[in-house]
């Protein structure tokens, strides 16, 4: 390794939190400007996958159906191969990620649309633990603009647990996006598609290196948090958009000061939504343990114009819309640590459905 | 046990070429094709310097120092990351590193370039 220098896997080093959240309660969901995917066939399995070739999804009116959009005019087509083998891979090539890595074909993808009435009270998901995710400024941390997000390489000793014996350490966080037209999130809520979303990538201490873990049953774990527009900016994001324009080039990648990555999250991190799925980028490997926060994070029409923007991606393309189409729940139940469900009653319902990482 | 290896490195006159290689083995085969792979340098008594990136995509980034004189590639179905060195300077004397970003970091030991007459 470098002389002098540490870090995770031998890495050598390169010489007021909340901005105020809403709950994702039905009331504030748009009943007319994002109509769900499909309405569900009687049985309660799900319909057959929409992908984002054929249309724009749930983020357009329904009046836009009849014109569809596809949301890939960012990001060229799959073939454009600039080296040996089959592993390029876009956001506008969805339906060729099965060709890249077949697990992209599975039956346990992410991201899946959160319908608030089909989920499962669970009481014995507790509030998740964080611990050493305030950093300070030194030492930096490496963002990265690698085509496809940006990405914050977090350094080692960020732990989160889901529960007990159940701990994780936080690898890196990306975003995904849409435009100043069309939101991008990658997961929905009753079809809604937010702005965008955040990802906290965590790998499981039962393993020491990630490929170890890739497509193992709670393996990796990862907390999303849906970015929504209000009036005031977001300082804790502020330290990561005011830095984009030093990586709008695709591949570039700068050092930035430590921050309080808990501050990216919601404060509420008691109310959530579970499930397992996969990595929403090829390989796409299953069995990851998703946890999708009920309160969003709020940021300024300025801050979300400019993660939109800013970047750009292969095949000189701004980099947008970079969000995976929702995929089909295949019998699995979203579980949440709260009555989510409109006609919830007041005692748990499928307590047993619960599951355990790993299980 | 993830190991990306360095070789190609060597002593050269100003003005000559090298070329290094980067071959992945082990657990590092299985997430090549999706790392941003890069090349680091770091010269003696110096921090460490990003040379070159080349993304998943096939996206290309150079220092300013290097640019028009080095290129990156790679090729997927070897598991193989490649930095071409030409017109090399004294100033380019340094251990070279090969570095894969895939959700973390994984580090090769590294070859010596030395640039001298």
């Known amino acids: 390794q470098p002389q002098g220098l540490s870090g995770m896997q031998g890495e050598p080093s390169l010489g007021d939190s909340s901005s105020g959240e809403d709950e994702l309660g039905v009331d504030v969901l748009p009943s007319e400007e994002d109509a769900p995917e499909e309405a569900d066939p009687p049985d309660g399995e799900d319909p057959p996958e929409v992908n984002s070739e054929d249309r724009m999804e749930e983020s357009l009116g329904l009046e836009d159906l009849s014109t569809p959009e596809a949301p890939e005019h960012s990001q060229g087509s799959h073939g454009d191969e600039k080296g040996g083998g089959h592993s390029h891979w876009s956001y506008g090539g969805t339906l060729l990620w099965p060709q890249v890595s077949p697990a992209c074909a599975g039956r346990f993808q992410s991201p899946v649309d959160i319908r608030l009435e089909r989920t499962a009270f669970c009481r014995t998901l507790q509030p998740l633990e964080l611990l050493g995710y305030e950093l300070q400024p030194l030492p930096e941390l490496s963002l990265s603009n690698n085509g496809h997000t940006v990405q914050l390489t977090l350094p080692p000793g960020l732990k989160m647990a889901l529960g007990p014996g159940q701990e994780y350490r936080a690898l890196q966080l990306h975003l995904h996006w849409g435009t100043s037209d069309h939101p991008g999130s990658e997961h929905t809520v009753n079809g809604h598609r937010f702005p965008a979303e955040i990802h906290v990538v965590h790998l499981s201490t039962a393993f020491s290196e990630l490929h170890e873990a890739l497509g193992r049953p709670g393996g990796l774990a990862v907390l999303a948090a849906f970015l929504q527009e209000s009036p005031e900016e977001n300082s804790a994001y502020e330290q990561l958009l005011s830095h984009l324009e030093e990586i709008s080039e695709e591949g570039s990648k700068i050092e930035i000061p430590g921050l309080d990555v808990s501050a990216l999250l919601p404060s509420d991190l008691s109310r959530y939504y579970r499930y397992e799925g996969s990595l929403t980028t090829p390989p796409c490997s299953q069995g990851v343990i998703w946890t999708v926060f009920n309160e969003t994070v709020k940021l300024s029409a300025k801050q979300l114009h400019t993660l939109s923007v800013s970047l750009w991606g292969p095949r000189d393309s701004r980099l947008q819309l970079n969000f995976r189409a929702t995929q089909p729940l295949n019998g699995r139940t979203i579980e949440a640590s709260f009555p989510a469900a409109e006609d919830s009653s007041p005692e748990p319902v499928h307590v047993n459905s619960c599951f355990t990482a790993g299980d | 046990q993830v190991q990306l290896v360095e070789s190609g490195g060597g002593l050269v006159q100003p003005g000559g070429s090298l070329r290094l290689s980067c071959s992945a083995s082990?657990?590092?085969?299985?997430?090549?094709?999706?790392?941003?792979m890069h090349w680091y340098r770091q010269a003696p008594g110096k921090g460490l310097e990003l040379v070159a990136v080349i993304t998943s995509a096939g996206g290309t980034y150079y220092a300013d120092s290097v640019k028009g004189r080095f290129t990156i590639s790679r090729d997927n179905s070897k598991k193989t990351l490649y930095l071409q060195m030409n017109s090399l300077r004294a100033e380019d004397t340094a251990v070279y590193y090969c570095?894969?970003?895939?959700?973390?970091?994984?580090w090769g030991q590294g070859t010596q370039v030395t640039v001298s007459s």
């Open positions: 082990g657990g590092a085969r299985n997430i090549f094709s999706f790392a941003a």
């Open positions: 570095n894969a970003d895939y959700y973390q970091d994984y």
